[in-house]
Amino acid sequence: SKLKGPELSLKGTQHVTQAGQTLHLQCRGEAAHQWSLPETVSKESKRLSITKSACGRNGKQFCSTLTLNAAQANHTGFYSCKYLAVPTSKKKETESAIYIFISDTGRPFVEMYSEIPEIIHMTEGRELIIPCRVTSPNITVTLKKFPLDTLIPDGKRVIWDSRKGFIISNATYKEIGLLTCEATVNGHLYKTNYLTHRQTNTIIDVQISTPRPVKLLRGHTLILNCTATTPLNTRVQMTWSYPDEKNKRASVRRRIDQSNSHANIFYSVLTIDKVQNKDKGLYTCRVRSGPSFKSVNTSVHIYDKAFITVKHRKQQVLETVAGKRSYRLSMKVKAFPSPEVVWLKDGLPATEKSARYLTRGYSLIIKDVTEEDAGNYTILLSIKQSNVFKNLTATLIVNVKPQIYEKAVSSFPDPALYPLGSRQILTCTAYGIPRPTIKWCWRPCNHNHSEARYDFCSNNEESFILDPDSNIGNRIESITQRMAIIEGKNKTASTLVVADSRISGIYSCIASNKVGTVGRNISFYITDVPNGFHVNLEKMPTEGEDLKLSCTVNKFLYRDVTWILLRTVNNRTMHYSISKQKMAITKEHSITLNLTIMNVSLEDSGTYACRARNVYTGEEILQKKEVTIRDQEAPYLLRNLSDHTVAISSSTTLDCHANGAPEPQITWFKNNHKIQQEPGIILGPGSSTLFIERVTEEDEGVYHCKATNQKGSVESSAYLTVQGTSDKSNLE
């Protein structure tokens, strides 16, 4: 016969009872049955009792009485009674339900979210329920989109159901926000709040937060943590696939972190206790949200026991260069679990030796490499708990680019000058690893005799490699090389000896090794002028004479030669240019600038200076000459001639020293006849001295000298007596 459904003692679809009262509800049926209650009513609660009994005619029916003492507002909901073990296809006839409102004037809403809004996920175009169900069916509820908008139920798009809340049949983005259900009971306003989030299917990121690949010893626990990051309004399903999935080897724990105000973070943690070899392989974490899908995988390696293998990455001897910002010394290591790493340099812990040594994984990083970093490096690898130890040594050679020491210590701002014809020794001392070779080169200077430019020595000229037999440039005496220990380092000193300095140019010593090449240029400028700069005054002139000054400078060291006159006006020294370089005479090694002032007067006295500019420093150099023009003065004799006697055949000197300005011209007369220089009669400097060799009788007579200049003349005379007879008279 057809089974009749269970009957409840309260008729109708709903019933209202007051909070604090006892709810009695009986179920009568033709089979054994059970109660289904609102989630808030715990079957273990002391308030609740369910008593079963046989009832009806002949006790053939099943009765069950539910008693809920001191019913509370949150006990509002569906109470149903259904038969046990009846096919679900006949559900309608096997279950009876009633919705019971537990009315509480102080609590109009069954679930109150006043402080923290309840989050509701919505999908546009779908039904959205704002679940502000009430404890009494006749409570008036208003739905507001906070704070200003009211959503009015229209029976179509917005429907009010006191058992469910507000049903929005076709939700749009306009319903996103803070939705508040408001009810006023006995003059009190009650609110319950909901935050609607648009459900999206965006998966921002998926990661397995374990290093890849994962390595484990057999028997240990594998833990893999998969993290999915999504926007706040996304939910995801996370699944794992792994090698021994069919035997359900793994346990998976899930949790969600919603503490971040911008994103949700979902965690899925896979754990396998006591891993075996069969657990090795690919582990994949799959994340799905609606149509969106992302996955990430990692490999798991299982090892039977701890091990270390270490090999040289390239060769056993390594090379680097001093000055390198960073050098990585690394070995090829395979090990599990990760060993402790210590690097030794020449047997001592490297990182203790210098702060420039850093350990990174299986590498030693040397910062700012210096030649002191050369040596033997040993990597010590140890897995102490398993008593596994390995070490390996590599040799590091630090090559050094050549350095020329004279280049570093040279304090000359401009080139040295080498005297013409001198012997010179040039030296270059070089250091580098490997030991550098040193060669010498010669580059002649460019002689430019055009007036527009000064001579110069540039790098444009062709360079010649020298050897001791070279006949290019200056004659070379020798090129020698020797080793010398300087500052504790084995350095190479190369010496070039120039036998005869004649040609200006540039000598270069070039030190080379496999790291690089360095050169030192030695400007070899020949000078025929002392110190490369010389001023000469022919003689101090007298009024009316010519002033003749010359200035000679080394042509490779100086340019812009000018004569200037220094005059002091109002305590200020003024420079007056009186001659220019274009008047200069360029010779092989020097430039000479002559200055001639004709027919000088006293006003031409003063300080004359030769000015030239140093080609290398740009500095102007002055060499001064004080010139005092003398007044004209009539001649006067310092001593008059006096008579004297001289023996025949001997020699005699007559002096006629006169002063005057300009310097007087001396003329000699004998017996009023002008004396000319002839054999046996010598006129000394300026004709002031008359020297007679092997006096004869004919030399006797009146001698007189006359000193003459523009201002006048002065005379003096004396008689020369020749004593004794000549050979001729003796013969007679």
């Epitope: 809004p117 906070f146 704070p147 908008d149 009211t150 306009k174 996103i176 803070l178 709040n193 935050l195």
Partner: antibody, heavy 119, light 111 residues
Framework: EVQLLESGGGSVQPGGSLRLSCTAS????????MNWVRQAPGKGLDWVSS?????????YHVDSVKGRFTISRDNSKNTLYLQMNSLRAEDTAIYYC???????????WGQGTTVTVSS | QSVLTQPPSASGTPGQRVTISCSGS????????VNWYQQIPGTAPKLLIY???QRPSGVPDRFSGSKSGTSASLAISGLQSDDEADYYC???????????FGGGTKLTVLG
């Protein structure tokens, strides 16, 4: 970029009128409630008026301006208005236009327009 | 006189934690959510906290809000010199049918 730009401020004598405008950009204007908030010189913030999304159901005003000020909006022009009549000296302030946040509060503020009422 | 009550001033040294209180009544804070605004002198206010404790994006997590009954508070930890500003609490008021603000608290960062 979400922006609100107020205009229409100025000096007026007591009893006079002014109309403030606020032009919105960078968001869907018709989907948000809007407000006017003022700040008297050296004083705190005071709410003046609010209007709901459509401008057809709800407008709210602080008691001190009721009957004198009217808030309105033109969604087609993305503009919010405040018509101020019978102005008093105590209405002197910077007037800020603000947008309601989806989840409560005023999340966007204009730079303000100054209204000075003095004889 | 403001509907919500705030202390007129607060101060702290850099790195310190400072708390600003805001008290109201059932019709505002008691029944509604609290927002906090920061106003740096000469600029428009900026939303700092909404829904009692939520931070808009871009607001550092040094700022936190809480509510209990008819009172709310704003806490600023690891105080920085650029936190010097006026802070206002606000809530909807069901009786007045409008927004209500606190009188503002001037925060000074010392030293």
């Amino acid at each position: 970029e979400v922006q609100l730009l107020e205009s229409g401020g100025g000096s007026v004598q007591p009893g006079g009128s002014l109309r403030l405008s606020c032009t919105a950009s960078g968001f869907n204007f018709e989907d948000y409630g809007m407000n006017w908030v003022r700040q008297a010189p050296g004083k705190g913030l005071d709410w003046v008026s609010s209007i709901n999304r459509n401008g057809d159901i709800s407008t709210y005003h602080v008691d001190s301006v009721k009957g004198r000020f009217t808030i309105s909006r033109d969604n087609s022009k993305n503009t919010l208005y405040l018509q101020m009549n019978s102005l008093r000296a105590e209405d002197t302030a910077i007037y800020y236009c603000t947008k309601n946040h989806d989840y409560h509060g005023m999340d966007v503020w204009g730079q303000g327009t100054t209204v000075t009422v003095s004889s | 006189q403001s509907v919500l009550t705030q202390p007129p001033s607060a101060s702290g040294t850099p790195g310190q934690r400072v708390t600003i209180s805001c008290s109201g009544s059932r019709s505002n804070i008691g029944n509604n959510f609290v927002n906090w605004y920061q106003q740096i002198p000469g600029t428009a206010p900026k939303l700092l906290i909404y829904l009692n404790s939520q931070r808009p994006s871009g607001v550092p997590d040094r700022f936190s809000g809480s509510k209990s009954g008819t009172s709310a508070s704003l806490a600023i930890s690891g105080l920085q010199s650029d936190d010097e500003a006026d802070y206002y609490c606000a809530s909807w008021d069901d009786s007045l049918n409008g927004w209500v603000f606190g009188g503002g608290t001037k925060l000074t960062v010392l030293g």
